[in-house]
């Protein structure tokens, strides 16, 4: 999906209003310095691409974040403010249902959510030059 036509300001407002708080809740008990940010993004569409990938694609050591509250809200925000996003996700959702596993918060998942926090922060500051 090409995130170029999303309403970035609305997605930013949704993040600041509620998604950010859910990410903090997920990470509660973890020091903010515990993980290094290794994933970066260069502009808002790129940030949303990386956010979608890290939130919804299973990775080794972190089978699924998709049922976490921050993920459900992220999916909803993209569905509302990215035209056509919902339609592109129907097949992906059906595939995900088949391989759904029970929720387990592993250290790898905590690291992944820490990366997500960094991507969201970057998304909210689009005019900053890449380090």
């Amino acid at each position: 999906y090409d995130f170029t036509n999303c309403d970035f300001e609305k997605i930013k407002a949704a993040y600041l209003s509620t998604i950010s708080k859910d990410l903090i809740t997920y990470m509660s008990g973890t020091k903010s310095t515990e993980f290094n940010n290794t994933v970066s993004c260069s502009n808002r569409p790129h940030c949303l691409t990386e956010i979608q990938s890290l939130t919804f694609n299973p990775t080794a050591g972190c089978a699924s974040l998709a049922k976490e509250m921050f993920a459900m809200k992220t999916k909803a925000a993209l569905a509302i403010w990215c035209p056509g996003y919902s339609e592109t996700q129907i097949n992906a959702t059906q595939a995900m249902k088949k391989r759904r596993k029970r929720k387990v918060t592993t250290n790898k998942c905590l690291e992944q959510v820490s990366q997500l926090q960094g991507l969201w922060r970057r998304f909210n500051r689009p005019l900053l030059k890449q380090q």
Partner: nanobody, 132 residues
Framework: QLQLVESGGGLVQAGGSLRLSCAAS????????IAWFRQAPGKEREGVSF????????YYADSVKGRFTISSDNAKNTVYLQMDSLKPDDTADYYC?????????????????????????WGQGTQVTVSS
């Protein structure tokens, strides 16, 4: 241009009722979501209720569930908030607000409808005072 005009506020005794109206003009009403917010003196603006004009889906704040009812008359481009069993705590300025994408994505909007930062257009407000 897009305009929202509220009416129906006033002074009422505890236990009484009021019906607020939000008349909209200047946009395709059917595609929009309309929400009611309220703000009491010294407090933050809070979401009261939401309706999708495309499918009629409605959401309510816990504090008004069972007492307030939101409805929409698409022919008149007007949204109503019927407020029953009013309490002194309901005293506030009431505002209606419109947003252009949540109206056609009402199921996904359950997470976001109550956040004022997401709305593009606002009315000037109507005052509701509930005396004990």
């Amino acid at each position: 241009q897009l305009q929202l005009v509220e009416s129906g506020g006033g002074l009422v005794q505890a236990g009484g009722s009021l019906r607020l109206s939000c008349a909209a003009s200047g946009f395709n009403f059917d595609d929009y979501a309309i929400a009611w917010f309220r703000q009491a003196p010294g407090k933050e603006r809070e979401g009261v209720s939401f309706i999708s004009n495309s499918d009629g889906t409605a959401y309510y704040a816990d504090s008004v569930k069972g007492r307030f009812t939101i409805s929409s008359d698409n022919a008149k481009n007007t949204v109503y908030l019927q407020m029953d069993s009013l309490k002194p705590d309901d005293t506030a300025d009431y505002y209606c607000a419109a947003e252009g994408r949540m109206g056609t994505h009402s199921r996904d909007s359950v997470y976001f409808w109550s956040f004022s930062a997401l709305y593009d257009y606002w009315g000037q407000g109507t005052q509701v005072t509930v005396s004990s």
